[in-house]
Protein backbone atom coordinates (compact mmCIF):
# COMPACT_ATOMS: atom_id res chain seq x y z
CA UNK A 1 0.00 0.00 0.00
CA UNK A 2 1.14 3.51 -0.68
CA UNK A 3 2.14 5.75 2.44
CA UNK A 4 -0.02 8.69 3.26
CA UNK A 5 1.52 11.99 1.10
CA UNK A 6 0.56 15.68 2.18
CA UNK A 7 -0.04 17.51 -0.58
CA UNK A 8 0.14 21.30 -0.75
CA UNK A 9 -0.33 21.87 -4.94
CA UNK A 10 -0.04 25.93 -4.51
CA UNK A 11 3.59 26.91 -4.74
CA UNK A 12 2.98 29.92 -3.78
CA UNK A 13 0.04 32.29 -3.28
CA UNK A 14 -0.21 35.49 -3.91
CA UNK A 15 -2.81 38.19 -1.82
CA UNK A 16 -3.85 41.62 -1.72
CA UNK A 17 -3.67 42.98 2.08
CA UNK A 18 -6.48 43.15 3.94
CA UNK A 19 -7.93 39.81 1.90
CA UNK A 20 -8.15 36.49 2.64
CA UNK A 21 -5.42 33.87 1.60
CA UNK A 22 -6.62 30.23 1.06
CA UNK A 23 -3.80 27.38 1.94
CA UNK A 24 -4.59 24.09 0.10
CA UNK A 25 -3.70 20.80 1.52
CA UNK A 26 -4.68 17.62 0.98
CA UNK A 27 -3.42 14.06 2.41
CA UNK A 28 -3.83 11.06 0.07
CA UNK A 29 -4.84 8.73 3.24
CA UNK A 30 -6.57 8.63 6.44
CA UNK A 31 -3.59 6.69 8.64
CA UNK A 32 -1.39 6.82 10.77
CA UNK A 33 -3.48 8.14 12.69
CA UNK A 34 -2.82 11.56 14.25
CA UNK A 35 -3.59 15.13 13.62
CA UNK A 36 -2.80 17.90 11.01
CA UNK A 37 -1.13 20.96 11.52
CA UNK A 38 -0.29 24.03 9.57
CA UNK A 39 3.05 26.56 10.32
CA UNK A 40 4.93 29.03 9.10
CA UNK A 41 8.82 28.19 8.93
CA UNK A 42 10.43 25.05 8.79
CA UNK A 43 12.99 23.80 11.85
CA UNK A 44 12.38 24.81 15.81
CA UNK A 45 11.75 28.33 15.31
CA UNK A 46 8.70 27.51 12.75
CA UNK A 47 5.65 29.25 13.94
CA UNK A 48 1.93 27.36 14.90
CA UNK A 49 -0.66 28.69 12.62
CA UNK A 50 -3.37 26.39 12.89
CA UNK A 51 -3.52 23.26 15.42
CA UNK A 52 -7.27 22.06 15.38
CA UNK A 53 -7.35 20.66 18.97
CA UNK A 54 -5.85 23.39 21.02
CA UNK A 55 -4.83 26.94 20.86
CA UNK A 56 -6.97 30.19 19.77
CA UNK A 57 -6.53 30.86 15.76
CA UNK A 58 -9.19 33.85 15.41
CA UNK A 59 -7.70 34.67 11.75
CA UNK A 60 -7.73 30.85 10.89
CA UNK A 61 -10.77 28.85 9.16
CA UNK A 62 -11.20 25.52 7.67
CA UNK A 63 -12.50 25.36 4.10
CA UNK A 64 -13.94 22.00 4.95
CA UNK A 65 -16.36 21.72 7.72
CA UNK A 66 -14.79 20.75 10.61
CA UNK A 67 -17.52 17.96 11.12
CA UNK A 68 -17.06 15.93 8.26
CA UNK A 69 -16.17 12.13 8.15
CA UNK A 70 -13.22 11.11 7.24
CA UNK A 71 -11.83 14.42 5.79
CA UNK A 72 -8.64 14.44 3.70
CA UNK A 73 -9.10 18.46 3.02
CA UNK A 74 -6.57 20.31 5.89
CA UNK A 75 -7.09 23.74 3.97
CA UNK A 76 -7.14 26.72 5.89
CA UNK A 77 -8.44 30.74 5.40
CA UNK A 78 -6.16 33.27 6.84
CA UNK A 79 -8.43 36.33 6.91
CA UNK A 80 -7.43 40.06 7.08
CA UNK A 81 -3.71 39.10 5.97
CA UNK A 82 -1.28 41.87 6.59
CA UNK A 83 2.63 41.40 5.33
CA UNK A 84 3.95 40.27 8.52
CA UNK A 85 2.27 37.17 7.19
CA UNK A 86 4.14 36.58 4.23
CA UNK A 87 6.12 33.31 4.29
CA UNK A 88 6.27 29.69 3.72
CA UNK A 89 3.26 27.43 5.21
CA UNK A 90 3.59 23.95 5.55
CA UNK A 91 0.70 21.52 6.59
CA UNK A 92 2.39 18.67 8.69
CA UNK A 93 0.94 15.38 9.31
CA UNK A 94 1.01 14.10 12.43
CA UNK A 95 1.67 10.38 14.01
CA UNK A 96 -0.65 9.83 17.29
CA UNK A 97 1.79 9.17 19.72
CA UNK A 98 1.93 9.32 23.99
CA UNK A 99 2.36 11.94 25.25
CA UNK A 100 3.45 13.85 22.10
CA UNK A 101 2.31 13.29 18.35
CA UNK A 102 4.77 12.77 16.50
CA UNK A 103 6.00 14.62 12.84
CA UNK A 104 4.83 12.03 10.43
CA UNK A 105 5.13 14.08 6.95
CA UNK A 106 5.26 17.57 5.31
CA UNK A 107 3.93 18.85 2.30
CA UNK A 108 6.01 20.39 0.55
CA UNK A 109 5.32 24.21 1.51
CA UNK A 110 3.69 27.06 0.01
CA UNK A 111 5.07 30.39 -0.16
CA UNK A 112 2.36 33.20 0.57
CA UNK A 113 3.31 36.97 -0.60
CA UNK A 114 1.27 39.88 0.28
CA UNK A 115 0.81 42.58 -1.79
CA UNK A 116 0.50 45.57 -0.02
CA UNK A 117 -0.21 48.94 -1.29
CA UNK A 118 2.73 51.92 -0.61
CA UNK A 119 1.02 54.87 1.69
CA UNK A 120 0.23 58.24 0.01
CA UNK A 121 3.64 59.84 -0.69
CA UNK A 122 4.45 62.95 1.85
CA UNK A 123 6.75 65.59 -0.01
CA UNK A 124 8.74 68.05 2.53
CA UNK A 125 10.29 70.80 1.49
CA UNK A 126 13.08 72.88 2.97
CA UNK A 127 12.76 74.32 6.51
CA UNK A 128 13.48 77.66 5.18
CA UNK A 129 12.30 79.55 2.23
CA UNK A 130 14.70 80.37 -0.80
CA UNK A 131 14.73 82.79 -3.55
CA UNK A 132 15.39 82.18 -7.35
CA UNK A 133 17.87 80.82 -8.81
CA UNK A 134 18.77 78.85 -5.77
CA UNK A 135 18.72 75.12 -5.96
CA UNK A 136 16.08 73.63 -3.18
CA UNK A 137 15.76 70.15 -1.89
CA UNK A 138 12.58 67.98 -1.87
CA UNK A 139 12.01 64.77 0.05
CA UNK A 140 9.24 61.95 -0.70
CA UNK A 141 8.48 58.95 1.13
CA UNK A 142 6.03 56.29 1.29
CA UNK A 143 5.86 53.62 3.46
CA UNK A 144 4.43 49.37 3.75
CA UNK A 145 4.41 48.55 0.18
CA UNK A 146 5.13 45.14 -0.98
CA UNK A 147 6.60 43.70 -3.35
CA UNK A 148 9.83 45.48 -3.22
CA UNK A 149 9.44 46.72 -6.97
CA UNK A 150 8.12 50.63 -7.53
CA UNK A 151 8.58 53.35 -9.32
CA UNK A 152 9.01 57.10 -8.34
CA UNK A 153 8.67 59.85 -10.09
CA UNK A 154 9.39 63.65 -9.60
CA UNK A 155 7.61 66.50 -12.04
CA UNK A 156 7.16 70.14 -11.48
CA UNK A 157 4.46 71.76 -13.10
CA UNK A 158 4.25 68.93 -15.21
CA UNK A 159 7.54 68.50 -16.46
CA UNK A 160 9.65 65.28 -15.46
CA UNK A 161 12.78 66.00 -12.98
CA UNK A 162 15.94 64.15 -13.48
CA UNK A 163 17.91 65.17 -10.81
CA UNK A 164 16.93 62.77 -7.68
CA UNK A 165 18.06 60.03 -5.77
CA UNK A 166 16.15 57.32 -4.54
CA UNK A 167 16.64 54.72 -1.95
CA UNK A 168 14.44 51.74 -1.05
CA UNK A 169 14.62 49.99 2.42
CA UNK A 170 15.52 47.67 3.44
CA UNK A 171 18.08 46.14 0.85
CA UNK A 172 17.15 42.75 2.13
CA UNK A 173 13.89 40.57 2.31
CA UNK A 174 11.17 42.02 4.27
CA UNK A 175 7.85 41.95 5.01
CA UNK A 176 7.19 45.05 3.90
CA UNK A 177 9.56 48.08 2.76
CA UNK A 178 9.83 52.30 2.64
CA UNK A 179 10.98 54.05 -0.41
CA UNK A 180 12.51 57.54 0.42
CA UNK A 181 13.38 59.75 -2.01
CA UNK A 182 15.26 63.13 -2.79
CA UNK A 183 14.82 65.88 -5.64
CA UNK A 184 16.74 69.32 -6.12
CA UNK A 185 14.68 72.25 -7.67
CA UNK A 186 16.03 75.58 -9.12
CA UNK A 187 13.95 77.89 -8.00
CA UNK A 188 12.31 81.12 -10.68
CA UNK A 189 10.51 84.34 -10.05
CA UNK A 190 7.61 82.28 -11.41
CA UNK A 191 7.01 79.68 -9.34
CA UNK A 192 4.85 80.82 -6.64
CA UNK A 193 1.96 79.26 -8.48
CA UNK A 194 4.39 76.07 -9.15
CA UNK A 195 3.56 72.14 -8.07
CA UNK A 196 6.09 69.74 -7.17
CA UNK A 197 4.69 65.83 -7.71
CA UNK A 198 6.30 62.86 -6.08
CA UNK A 199 4.45 59.94 -7.84
CA UNK A 200 4.72 56.41 -7.16
CA UNK A 201 3.36 53.37 -9.10
CA UNK A 202 3.47 49.87 -7.69
CA UNK A 203 1.71 46.40 -8.94
CA UNK A 204 -1.24 46.92 -5.83
CA UNK A 205 -1.79 50.18 -7.75
CA UNK A 206 -3.04 48.56 -11.04
CA UNK A 207 -1.59 51.65 -12.91
CA UNK A 208 -3.28 54.36 -10.96
CA UNK A 209 -0.27 55.74 -9.30
CA UNK A 210 -0.07 57.78 -5.91
CA UNK A 211 0.55 61.24 -5.88
CA UNK A 212 2.22 64.02 -3.02
CA UNK A 213 2.65 67.10 -3.93
CA UNK A 214 4.11 70.67 -2.20
CA UNK A 215 3.41 74.14 -3.42
CA UNK A 216 6.45 75.47 -4.09
CA UNK A 217 4.33 78.39 -2.51
CA UNK A 218 5.54 77.48 0.49
CA UNK A 219 9.13 77.49 -0.73
CA UNK A 220 9.74 80.54 -2.42
CA UNK A 221 10.64 84.39 -1.22
CA UNK A 222 10.43 86.65 -4.71
CA UNK A 223 12.42 89.72 -3.05
CA UNK A 224 10.81 92.94 -4.26
CA UNK A 225 11.77 95.25 -6.50
CA UNK A 226 11.53 99.30 -5.03
CA UNK A 227 11.13 102.45 -7.25
CA UNK A 228 10.87 105.91 -5.95
CA UNK A 229 9.13 108.55 -8.21
CA UNK A 230 8.12 112.13 -7.28
CA UNK A 231 4.78 112.87 -8.90
CA UNK A 232 3.12 116.02 -10.19
CA UNK A 233 2.78 118.89 -8.26
CA UNK A 234 -0.70 118.73 -6.52
CA UNK A 235 -0.69 121.77 -4.88
CA UNK A 236 1.55 124.93 -5.84
CA UNK A 237 3.88 123.75 -3.00
CA UNK A 238 3.05 119.88 -2.32
CA UNK A 239 4.62 117.03 -4.18
CA UNK A 240 3.13 113.52 -3.55
CA UNK A 241 6.28 111.29 -3.42
CA UNK A 242 5.34 107.47 -4.42
CA UNK A 243 7.31 104.00 -3.68
CA UNK A 244 6.72 101.02 -5.64
CA UNK A 245 7.04 97.71 -4.40
CA UNK A 246 6.75 95.13 -6.83
CA UNK A 247 6.75 91.46 -7.45
CA UNK A 248 7.09 90.15 -4.33
CA UNK A 249 5.82 87.00 -2.12
CA UNK A 250 5.10 85.93 0.53
CA UNK A 251 2.92 89.23 1.21
CA UNK A 252 4.34 89.60 4.96
CA UNK A 253 5.95 93.36 4.22
CA UNK A 254 6.92 96.58 6.17
CA UNK A 255 7.66 99.61 4.54
CA UNK A 256 9.26 102.47 6.07
CA UNK A 257 9.60 105.76 5.24
CA UNK A 258 12.93 108.20 6.08
CA UNK A 259 13.41 112.00 5.47
CA UNK A 260 17.16 112.78 5.88
CA UNK A 261 17.45 109.49 7.29
CA UNK A 262 15.12 109.93 10.06
CA UNK A 263 12.04 107.72 10.93
CA UNK A 264 8.84 109.61 8.89
CA UNK A 265 6.00 106.53 9.21
CA UNK A 266 6.11 102.74 9.18
CA UNK A 267 3.40 101.00 7.77
CA UNK A 268 2.60 97.36 6.98
CA UNK A 269 1.45 96.06 3.42
CA UNK A 270 -2.13 95.27 3.45
CA UNK A 271 -4.09 96.03 0.59
CA UNK A 272 -1.98 94.62 -1.85
CA UNK A 273 -2.78 93.58 -5.83
CA UNK A 274 -1.89 90.22 -6.80
CA UNK A 275 0.08 89.41 -9.93
CA UNK A 276 -0.95 86.61 -12.32
CA UNK A 277 2.08 85.09 -11.46
CA UNK A 278 1.19 84.81 -7.58
CA UNK A 279 3.36 87.90 -6.89
CA UNK A 280 2.40 91.01 -5.11
CA UNK A 281 2.13 94.93 -5.81
CA UNK A 282 1.96 97.29 -3.27
CA UNK A 283 2.57 101.07 -3.24
CA UNK A 284 3.10 103.75 -0.77
CA UNK A 285 2.85 107.23 -1.11
CA UNK A 286 4.16 110.44 1.07
CA UNK A 287 2.66 113.77 0.68
CA UNK A 288 5.58 116.67 0.99
CA UNK A 289 4.71 120.19 1.86
CA UNK A 290 8.49 121.54 -0.17
CA UNK A 291 7.75 125.17 1.52
CA UNK A 292 8.49 123.86 5.07
CA UNK A 293 12.03 123.14 3.52
CA UNK A 294 14.88 125.56 2.81
CA UNK A 295 17.29 122.67 1.74
CA UNK A 296 16.89 119.66 -0.65
CA UNK A 297 14.94 116.69 1.04
CA UNK A 298 16.57 113.26 0.90
CA UNK A 299 13.03 110.57 1.15
CA UNK A 300 14.07 106.76 1.56
CA UNK A 301 11.77 103.98 1.16
CA UNK A 302 13.14 100.68 3.18
CA UNK A 303 11.35 97.94 2.61
CA UNK A 304 11.46 94.58 5.29
CA UNK A 305 10.27 91.69 3.24
CA UNK A 306 9.31 88.47 5.03
CA UNK A 307 11.90 89.08 7.93
CA UNK A 308 15.02 89.41 5.69
CA UNK A 309 17.29 92.80 5.72
CA UNK A 310 15.92 95.53 5.03
CA UNK A 311 16.34 96.99 1.07
CA UNK A 312 15.81 100.55 0.10
CA UNK A 313 15.51 103.36 -2.39
CA UNK A 314 16.00 106.93 -2.39
CA UNK A 315 14.98 110.04 -4.03
CA UNK A 316 16.46 113.67 -3.28
CA UNK A 317 13.67 116.19 -3.49
CA UNK A 318 14.84 119.58 -4.47
CA UNK A 319 13.29 122.27 -2.66
CA UNK A 320 14.75 125.67 -3.63
CA UNK A 321 12.24 126.86 -6.46
CA UNK A 322 9.13 126.77 -4.20
CA UNK A 323 8.00 130.52 -2.89
CA UNK A 324 7.10 130.30 0.88
CA UNK A 325 2.98 130.74 1.10
CA UNK A 326 1.83 132.44 4.11
CA UNK A 327 0.37 130.03 6.73
CA UNK A 328 1.24 126.65 5.03
CA UNK A 329 3.02 126.00 8.24
CA UNK A 330 0.02 125.82 9.73
CA UNK A 331 -2.96 124.18 7.15
CA UNK A 332 -1.47 120.76 6.61
CA UNK A 333 -3.47 118.87 3.63
CA UNK A 334 -4.24 115.59 4.25
CA UNK A 335 -5.51 113.04 1.85
CA UNK A 336 -5.50 109.53 2.86
CA UNK A 337 -3.31 107.17 5.06
CA UNK A 338 0.02 106.62 3.39
CA UNK A 339 0.02 110.61 2.59
CA UNK A 340 2.33 112.91 5.24
CA UNK A 341 2.92 116.96 4.99
CA UNK A 342 6.39 117.79 5.84
CA UNK A 343 6.80 121.64 7.36
CA UNK B 1 -19.96 -2.06 5.68
CA UNK B 2 -19.34 -5.45 7.85
CA UNK B 3 -17.26 -6.23 10.42
CA UNK B 4 -16.94 -10.31 11.38
CA UNK B 5 -14.59 -11.33 14.38
CA UNK B 6 -13.61 -15.17 15.10
CA UNK B 7 -11.01 -16.69 17.50
CA UNK B 8 -12.57 -16.25 20.35
CA UNK B 9 -12.70 -19.16 23.03
CA UNK B 10 -12.04 -20.33 26.13
CA UNK B 11 -8.40 -19.86 27.74
CA UNK B 12 -6.08 -20.60 30.25
CA UNK B 13 -4.47 -17.90 32.11
CA UNK B 14 -1.06 -17.38 30.67
CA UNK B 15 -1.97 -18.84 27.22
CA UNK B 16 -2.51 -17.13 24.03
CA UNK B 17 -5.11 -16.66 21.94
CA UNK B 18 -5.60 -14.71 18.05
CA UNK B 19 -8.43 -12.92 17.24
CA UNK B 20 -9.32 -12.11 13.51
CA UNK B 21 -11.93 -9.81 12.07
CA UNK B 22 -13.09 -10.12 8.68
CA UNK B 23 -13.75 -6.51 7.21
CA UNK B 24 -16.12 -6.06 3.65
CA UNK B 25 -17.77 -3.23 2.00
CA UNK B 26 -14.99 -0.77 2.61
CA UNK B 27 -11.42 0.81 1.57
CA UNK B 28 -10.20 -1.32 4.70
CA UNK B 29 -6.30 -0.32 3.46
CA UNK B 30 -7.55 3.62 4.40
CA UNK B 31 -8.94 3.51 7.77
CA UNK B 32 -7.65 2.51 11.56
CA UNK B 33 -9.38 -0.42 13.09
CA UNK B 34 -9.78 -0.58 16.70
CA UNK B 35 -10.66 -3.18 19.13
CA UNK B 36 -12.71 -2.62 22.29
CA UNK B 37 -13.89 -4.41 24.64
CA UNK B 38 -16.52 -5.26 27.36
CA UNK B 39 -16.43 -7.67 30.26
CA UNK B 40 -19.41 -9.41 31.41
CA UNK B 41 -22.17 -6.94 32.74
CA UNK B 42 -19.57 -4.23 32.42
CA UNK B 43 -19.27 -1.07 30.09
CA UNK B 44 -17.13 -0.49 26.81
CA UNK B 45 -13.31 -0.59 27.75
CA UNK B 46 -11.30 0.33 24.23
CA UNK B 47 -7.89 -2.02 23.95
CA UNK B 48 -6.22 -1.08 20.62
CA UNK B 49 -5.97 0.83 17.68
CA UNK B 50 -3.91 0.44 14.92
CA UNK B 51 -3.56 3.30 11.78
CA UNK B 52 -0.77 1.89 9.01
CA UNK B 53 2.10 1.13 10.96
CA UNK B 54 0.69 2.65 14.09
CA UNK B 55 -0.32 0.93 17.21
CA UNK B 56 -1.98 2.46 20.16
CA UNK B 57 -2.53 0.04 23.24
CA UNK B 58 -4.55 0.75 26.87
CA UNK B 59 -2.41 0.52 29.61
CA UNK B 60 -4.20 -2.68 30.90
CA UNK B 61 -3.06 -4.38 27.40
CA UNK B 62 0.58 -2.73 26.46
CA UNK B 63 3.36 -5.37 26.34
CA UNK B 64 0.86 -8.53 25.86
CA UNK B 65 -1.44 -7.76 22.87
CA UNK B 66 -0.28 -7.20 19.47
CA UNK B 67 -2.70 -5.64 17.00
CA UNK B 68 -1.92 -5.90 13.48
CA UNK B 69 -3.66 -6.05 9.80
CA UNK B 70 -2.96 -7.31 6.48
CA UNK B 71 -4.66 -5.22 4.03
CA UNK B 72 -3.97 -7.66 1.10
CA UNK B 73 -6.65 -10.11 3.37
CA UNK B 74 -8.83 -7.03 4.46
CA UNK B 75 -8.26 -8.54 7.88
CA UNK B 76 -7.70 -7.40 11.01
CA UNK B 77 -5.88 -9.13 14.13
CA UNK B 78 -5.13 -9.24 17.92
CA UNK B 79 -2.86 -11.42 19.14
CA UNK B 80 -3.22 -12.04 23.07
CA UNK B 81 -0.38 -13.45 25.20
CA UNK B 82 -0.30 -13.84 28.95
CA UNK B 83 -3.63 -13.97 29.31
CA UNK B 84 -5.57 -12.87 32.50
CA UNK B 85 -8.95 -13.14 34.31
CA UNK B 86 -10.00 -9.55 33.53
CA UNK B 87 -9.00 -9.93 30.03
CA UNK B 88 -12.35 -11.98 29.88
CA UNK B 89 -14.85 -10.18 27.94
CA UNK B 90 -16.81 -9.90 24.62
CA UNK B 91 -14.00 -8.33 21.82
CA UNK B 92 -15.49 -6.31 19.41
CA UNK B 93 -13.64 -5.10 15.88
CA UNK B 94 -14.81 -1.04 15.35
CA UNK B 95 -13.93 0.67 12.06
CA UNK B 96 -12.73 4.27 13.00
CA UNK B 97 -14.02 6.67 11.30
CA UNK B 98 -12.19 10.83 11.71
CA UNK B 99 -13.49 13.93 12.42
CA UNK B 100 -12.31 17.40 13.51
CA UNK B 101 -8.69 16.35 11.95
CA UNK B 102 -7.85 13.95 13.90
CA UNK B 103 -10.60 12.26 16.22
CA UNK B 104 -11.51 8.88 15.71
CA UNK B 105 -15.07 7.27 17.37
CA UNK B 106 -16.47 3.83 16.08
CA UNK B 107 -19.32 3.90 12.97
CA UNK B 108 -19.16 0.54 12.24
CA UNK B 109 -18.88 -2.34 14.48
CA UNK B 110 -18.71 -6.31 14.55
CA UNK B 111 -20.96 -8.36 16.96
CA UNK B 112 -17.96 -9.73 18.80
CA UNK B 113 -16.20 -12.61 20.18
CA UNK B 114 -16.15 -13.73 23.37
CA UNK B 115 -12.84 -14.35 25.06
CA UNK B 116 -13.26 -16.48 28.80
CA UNK B 117 -9.87 -16.77 30.48
CA UNK B 118 -10.47 -19.19 33.26
CA UNK B 119 -8.82 -22.47 34.61
CA UNK C 1 -6.43 10.40 31.03
CA UNK C 2 -10.12 11.86 30.35
CA UNK C 3 -12.54 10.03 32.85
CA UNK C 4 -16.43 10.38 31.46
CA UNK C 5 -18.91 10.30 34.02
CA UNK C 6 -22.48 9.56 32.98
CA UNK C 7 -25.65 9.86 34.96
CA UNK C 8 -28.05 8.83 36.30
CA UNK C 9 -26.92 5.40 36.21
CA UNK C 10 -30.50 4.43 35.58
CA UNK C 11 -33.27 6.19 34.07
CA UNK C 12 -36.76 5.04 34.05
CA UNK C 13 -39.06 5.84 31.95
CA UNK C 14 -42.55 5.14 30.50
CA UNK C 15 -42.99 5.05 26.18
CA UNK C 16 -43.10 8.00 24.53
CA UNK C 17 -41.85 10.20 27.15
CA UNK C 18 -38.53 12.38 26.98
CA UNK C 19 -35.28 10.83 27.99
CA UNK C 20 -32.30 13.08 29.09
CA UNK C 21 -28.65 11.90 30.24
CA UNK C 22 -25.67 13.55 30.61
CA UNK C 23 -22.25 12.72 30.23
CA UNK C 24 -19.01 14.82 32.28
CA UNK C 25 -15.77 14.97 31.34
CA UNK C 26 -12.74 15.36 33.73
CA UNK C 27 -11.38 18.27 31.11
CA UNK C 28 -12.67 19.83 28.07
CA UNK C 29 -12.77 17.97 25.35
CA UNK C 30 -14.34 20.34 22.89
CA UNK C 31 -16.58 19.09 20.59
CA UNK C 32 -15.27 15.45 20.40
CA UNK C 33 -17.28 13.18 22.11
CA UNK C 34 -19.79 10.38 20.21
CA UNK C 35 -23.21 8.97 22.04
CA UNK C 36 -23.47 4.77 21.28
CA UNK C 37 -26.32 2.68 22.22
CA UNK C 38 -26.42 -0.57 23.02
CA UNK C 39 -29.13 -3.03 23.25
CA UNK C 40 -29.06 -6.25 24.90
CA UNK C 41 -27.05 -8.87 23.77
CA UNK C 42 -26.10 -6.56 20.33
CA UNK C 43 -22.98 -4.48 19.02
CA UNK C 44 -22.80 -0.97 20.30
CA UNK C 45 -24.15 1.42 17.49
CA UNK C 46 -23.06 4.55 16.52
CA UNK C 47 -25.75 7.36 17.10
CA UNK C 48 -24.30 10.84 17.82
CA UNK C 49 -20.83 12.34 16.73
CA UNK C 50 -18.69 16.16 17.37
CA UNK C 51 -21.43 16.24 19.94
CA UNK C 52 -24.48 17.13 18.12
CA UNK C 53 -24.20 15.08 14.82
CA UNK C 54 -26.48 12.79 14.12
CA UNK C 55 -25.06 9.50 12.13
CA UNK C 56 -26.73 8.89 9.35
CA UNK C 57 -30.08 6.51 9.43
CA UNK C 58 -30.38 7.36 13.59
CA UNK C 59 -33.83 8.82 14.04
CA UNK C 60 -34.42 12.26 15.15
CA UNK C 61 -35.93 12.05 18.00
CA UNK C 62 -32.05 11.34 19.44
CA UNK C 63 -30.11 14.85 19.62
CA UNK C 64 -26.65 15.85 21.15
CA UNK C 65 -25.81 18.85 22.90
CA UNK C 66 -23.11 20.29 24.88
CA UNK C 67 -19.43 21.40 24.31
CA UNK C 68 -16.00 21.40 26.40
CA UNK C 69 -17.18 18.96 29.49
CA UNK C 70 -21.08 19.30 29.93
CA UNK C 71 -22.93 16.69 27.38
CA UNK C 72 -26.54 15.73 26.68
CA UNK C 73 -28.10 13.58 24.81
CA UNK C 74 -31.79 13.60 24.60
CA UNK C 75 -34.63 11.26 23.59
CA UNK C 76 -37.66 13.29 22.66
CA UNK C 77 -40.71 10.44 22.84
CA UNK C 78 -38.71 7.03 23.53
CA UNK C 79 -39.66 4.47 21.60
CA UNK C 80 -39.78 0.37 22.67
CA UNK C 81 -36.22 -0.31 20.89
CA UNK C 82 -35.04 2.68 22.41
CA UNK C 83 -34.65 0.90 26.37
CA UNK C 84 -30.81 0.11 25.87
CA UNK C 85 -27.53 1.17 27.33
CA UNK C 86 -26.26 4.56 26.33
CA UNK C 87 -22.68 5.06 26.44
CA UNK C 88 -20.22 8.44 25.64
CA UNK C 89 -16.63 8.55 24.23
CA UNK C 90 -14.19 11.32 24.24
CA UNK C 91 -11.78 11.13 21.18
CA UNK C 92 -10.66 14.41 21.99
CA UNK C 93 -6.70 13.22 23.67
CA UNK C 94 -6.00 9.59 23.06
CA UNK C 95 -4.43 7.24 23.71
CA UNK C 96 -6.81 5.96 25.37
CA UNK C 97 -10.13 6.29 24.20
CA UNK C 98 -12.04 6.45 27.02
CA UNK C 99 -16.25 5.68 27.51
CA UNK C 100 -17.87 6.80 30.52
CA UNK C 101 -19.99 3.82 32.63
CA UNK C 102 -23.13 4.12 31.03
CA UNK C 103 -26.40 4.95 31.28
CA UNK C 104 -29.64 1.98 31.02
CA UNK C 105 -32.89 3.53 30.27
CA UNK C 106 -35.63 0.83 31.55
CA UNK C 107 -39.22 1.15 31.04
CA UNK C 108 -41.36 2.61 33.94
Known amino acids: EEELQVIQPDKSVLVAAGETATLRCTATSLIPVGPIQWFRGAGPGRELIYNQKEGHFPRVTTVSDLTKRNNMDFSIRIGNITPADAGTYYCVKFRKGSPDDVEFKSGAGTELSVRAKPSAPVVSGPAARATPQHTVSFTCESHGFSPRDITLKWFKNGNELSDFQTNVDPVGESVSYSIHSTAKVVLTREDVHSQVICEVAHVTLQGDPLRGTANLSETIRVPPTLEVTQQPVRAENQVNVTCQVRKFYPQRLQLTWLENGNVSRTETASTVTENKDGTYNWMSWLLVNVSAHRDDVKLTCQVEHDGQPAVSKSHDLKVSAHPKEQGSNTAAENTGSNERNIY | VQLVESGGGVVQPGGSLRLSCAAS????????MTWVRQAPGEGLEWVSTIGSGDTYYADSVKGRFTISRDNSKNTLYLQMNSLRAEDTAVYYCAKDSTVSWSGDFFDYWGLGTRVTVSS | EIVLTQSPATLSVSPGERATFSCRAS??????LAWYQQRPGQAPRLLIYAARIRETGIPERFSGSGSGTEFTLTITSLQSEDFAVYYC??????????FGGGTKVEIK
Open chain 3, 89 to 98: QQYYDWPPFT
Open chain 2, 25 to 32: GFSFSNFA
Open chain 3, 27 to 32: QNVKND
